[in-house]
Every structure is written in C-alpha cells, then in structure tokens.
C-alpha cells in the first residue's frame, strides 16, 4: 500500500504520500483555529506507471495507454486514498468549540 | 458539475473531463476484445484552483495552501469522479462471452 508506513521510509519517485506540514495561521491564514497550531496534512505526488495502485479499470487502461503512447497527455494522477480526520479547537465568542474535521490527513495514495 | 455536458461544450482550461478515444487493438494491444473496436474512455486534466470542485476538506485545504504558497509542489489533482461501465464481447476459445467492465468511461471529474 502506498501509505505513510511505506512512503515515509522509502525514497519513492512514483506515486506516494509525502509529508506536508501546514501551519493554520501562516499557510492558510486561518487565525480562528486555536489548537493545533498546525498539522501534517500530507499530500500525494509522483508518476503513476502502469498498474501502480490503480484505483479503477479506467486508471489501469489509462496507465497502459500512457505506457504505449508516451507522447499522450492523458495519464492517471496520484491522489489521496485513505484520509483521517483532525480534531480542532476554536472559539465562538468566549465559548470554546471542539470539532472533528473529516478527511484532513492523507494516510495513503492511489493512481486515479 | 465538471461533466461531459459542460466540459465538451466549453473551452475550459481548469480541471475538466476531456474526450479520449481508445482503440483496444492499436492503443492497448488488446486483441482479445472483439466488440467494440474502441471507446471513449475520456480523461481528466487541468489545474485545480482553490475551491474548484473540491472532493474533500483536504483538497480544499491543499487548494488554499497552493494559492497562498504558489511555489509549493503540493496541489490537488484533476481525477475522475463519475465513471460508467462498458460492455465488451470477447471469445474464450470458440465460445463468445459478454462482460460489463466497470468504471471504464469517465463522465465527470473532481479535484482531489
């Protein structure tokens, strides 16, 4: 699986999850998030050669098409597969609120 | 929606579904598929600016991050959203077989 366990331990050029730390205030301008200051959102990147963690029959077909027609612009793209939520603390006036934001952390990638 | 109805009628630079005809024999080397000879598989391409058909909170966050940090390599990617099956005819020896291959035709795209 193209997950953090594999990708963070290997120098993988092809599609894999990459570490990306996002600071809410500095990187997003989100001053309203009090906790955490930031988090590892991570991201997916790298080429998708034929059969590499293909998401659907279409991505398999497109990967093969791209292999046999290397000049073609059509190829699968490395995108998030498994995502996890992130719990944040913010304030509405003087009242603290805790919310779980879904699909915030990329744990693995796929070729789609 | 970034579907064929919209994308095929507009000159859209950003993420959209694009027409792509694949000939099974010539483009994939699949001699075993006898009908159809080929089909419109289509593909997704184009930049994913902030908020464009964002698939998850992560893609929204990544889109904003990319907007505020344009030098960053991390950005959402334009990938298939809705896919449709394709029915094919092939032969196992002298016996004809019809099979519906799932997720073969891209009908719309999203930024993921």
């Amino acid at each position: 699986a193209l997950d953090t366990n594999y990708c963070f331990r290997n120098l993988e050029e092809n599609c894999c999850v990459r570490p990306l730390y996002i600071d809410f205030r500095q990187d997003l301008g989100w001053k309203w998030v009090h906790e955490p200051k930031g988090y590892y959102a991570n991201f997916c990147s790298g080429p998708c050669p034929y059969l590499r963690s293909a998401d659907t029959t279409h991505s398999t077909v497109l990967g093969l098409y791209n292999t046999l027609n290397p000049e073609a612009s059509a190829s699968p793209c490395c995108v998030p597969q498994d995502l996890e939520p992130l719990t944040i603390l913010y304030y509405v006036g003087r009242t603290p609120k805790v919310e779980q934001l879904s699909n915030m952390v990329v744990k693995s990638c796929k070729c789609s | 929606a970034l579907d064929t109805n919209y994308c095929f009628r507009n000159l859209e630079e950003n993420c959209c579904v694009r027409p792509l005809y694949i000939d099974f024999r010539q483009d994939l080397g699949w001699k075993w598929v006898h009908e159809p000879k080929g089909y419109y598989a289509n593909f997704c391409s184009g930049p994913c600016p902030y908020l464009r058909s964002a698939d998850t909170t992560h893609s929204t966050v990544l889109g904003l991050y990319n907007t505020l940090n344009p030098e960053a390599s991390a950005s959402p990617c334009c990938v298939p959203q809705d896919l449709e099956p394709l029915t094919i005819l092939y032969y196992v020896g002298r016996t004809p077989k019809v099979e519906q291959l799932s997720n073969m035709v891209v009908k719309s795209c999203k930024c993921s």
């Epitope: - | 001699k31 006898h34 009908e35 029915t87 005819l89 032969y91 196992v92 020896g93 002298r94 016996t95 004809p96 019809v98």
Partner: antibody, heavy 119, light 111 residues
C-alpha cells in the same frame, strides 16, 4: 498481408489417408484459432475441424461426419495447421479451405486444396 | 447445434436490382447487444470472402452496396444495386456457440 497456403490435396483411394497442411503468415498465428472448412461438389460450406490457440488448451472440434477419422493439429513454431485424414470416403471429396477466425467470423481464407476420393 | 436456414436457395436478378437474402437461426444467435451472424460471398474456383461480420459491420474492402441487419434469429443480407461481379453464392454463419455452422447458401444468378 495475411496469407494461408494449403497443400497436400490429391487423388486417394477409399480407405486411404492424406495429410493437409496450411502455412500461415502475416498475422500472430499463436493467438488465433484455425479451422478447416470444405465444400463438396454441388454442396455448401461445412466446418470440418477446428483448433483453438494454446491459451485455450488447443481445444479441437470435429464435425460428426469426420469424427474419429480426421485429426487436426498445429505447430505454432512453424505457423502451420494440419489435417490428418484417415479412412477416407467418397463423400470426403471436396475442396478443403484453411481459414482463421479472430473473432467469430472467418476473416481470411486460403485458396483451397482439392481432395478426391475415388477408386 | 444451431441450424441456419437461408432463403431463397437461389434467385435470378438483373444488374441494378436490389437483392435481399434472409437467414433464420433455429435459436437466437445474439448475446446482449451483439449479433453473432456473419455473411460470405463465394465464387466458383475462388475462396469464400467475408462480407459482413456481426450482422451489420462491413468487412474491410467490401463495397458499401452490401449491408446486413437483424438480431435474434432473423438476419438479412442486402445488395442495394446488384453488379455483374456480385453473381455468386452467399452464406450466413453464426458464432453463438460451438460448433459454428453455415447456412445452406443462396445462389444469385443472372436473369
């Protein structure tokens, strides 16, 4: 260009044997089933025998009229298909065509070889 | 085995005529939307030639005056305007199941 060249036909007495050969070129012989179709004088086309590719275990078919007398085989290394005909009868007299069916239809045919069974 | 019955068994026609040959199968030779019936032209002393595959698809190099239609058990070969070189015997053939079989043939003669 696809070419199918039959040989081995001729005059033979009833009860005798003949071996027909069909040398193929111009296509991926290993991938396709090969067939022998015959036409007896004044009759229509009849599928006599058939052999599919290695992928499908070289499965063979014989029409009822030739079963247990004819044997089809192929040599993929030589791109050749054979029809061994034993215990020949007068009713086996026909032009025998070698043909290839990539997808249900017989797309290519050889020129045919005449087999005459007569005393 | 699936039997194929062609009609007529022979016909006389003139150059320029529209000719229709039918082929009826003893059971359906269609599977899903695919019609597994094929048509051939056979002239004396020559090898048969594929005209139409899967009911309605024109084989490579075949003139557009030839066309095919049908599904299930009933199929038709049509020559829109008969030419001198079209006088021959025509056969249908199915590939719905093994064994594949041919129809008895239709001989098209000059009137």
């Amino acid at each position: 260009e696809v070419q199918l060249l039959e040989s081995g036909g001729g005059l033979v007495q009833p009860g005798g044997s003949l071996r027909l050969s069909c040398a193929a070129s111009g296509f991926d012989f290993n991938s396709y089933g090969m067939s022998w179709v015959r036409q007896a004088p004044g009759k229509g086309l009849e599928l006599v025998s058939d052999i599919v590719s290695k992928t499908y275990n070289y499965t063979t078919y014989y029409s009822d009229s030739v079963k247990d007398r004819f044997t089809i085989s192929r040599d993929d290394s030589k791109s050749t298909v054979y029809l061994q005909m034993n215990s020949l009868r007068a009713e086996d007299t026909a032009v025998y065509y070698c043909t290839v069916a990539p997808g249900g239809s017989f797309d290519y045919w050889g020129q045919g070889t005449l087999v005459t069974v007569s005393s | 085995d699936i039997q194929l019955t062609q009609s007529p068994s022979s016909l006389s026609a003139s150059v320029g005529d529209r000719v229709t040959i039918t082929c009826r199968a003893s059971q359906s030779v269609s599977i899903s939307r695919f019609n597994l019936m094929h048509w051939y032209q056979h002239k004396p002393g020559k090898q048969p030639k594929l005209l139409i595959y899967r009911a309605s698809n024109l084989a490579s190099g075949i003139p557009s005056r030839f066309s095919g239609s049908g599904s299930g058990t009933d199929f038709t070969l049509t020559i829109s305007s008969l030419q001198p070189e079209d006088f021959a015997t025509y056969y249908c053939q199915h590939s719905r199941e093994s064994p594949w079989t041919f129809g008895g043939g239709t001989k098209v003669e000059i009137k």
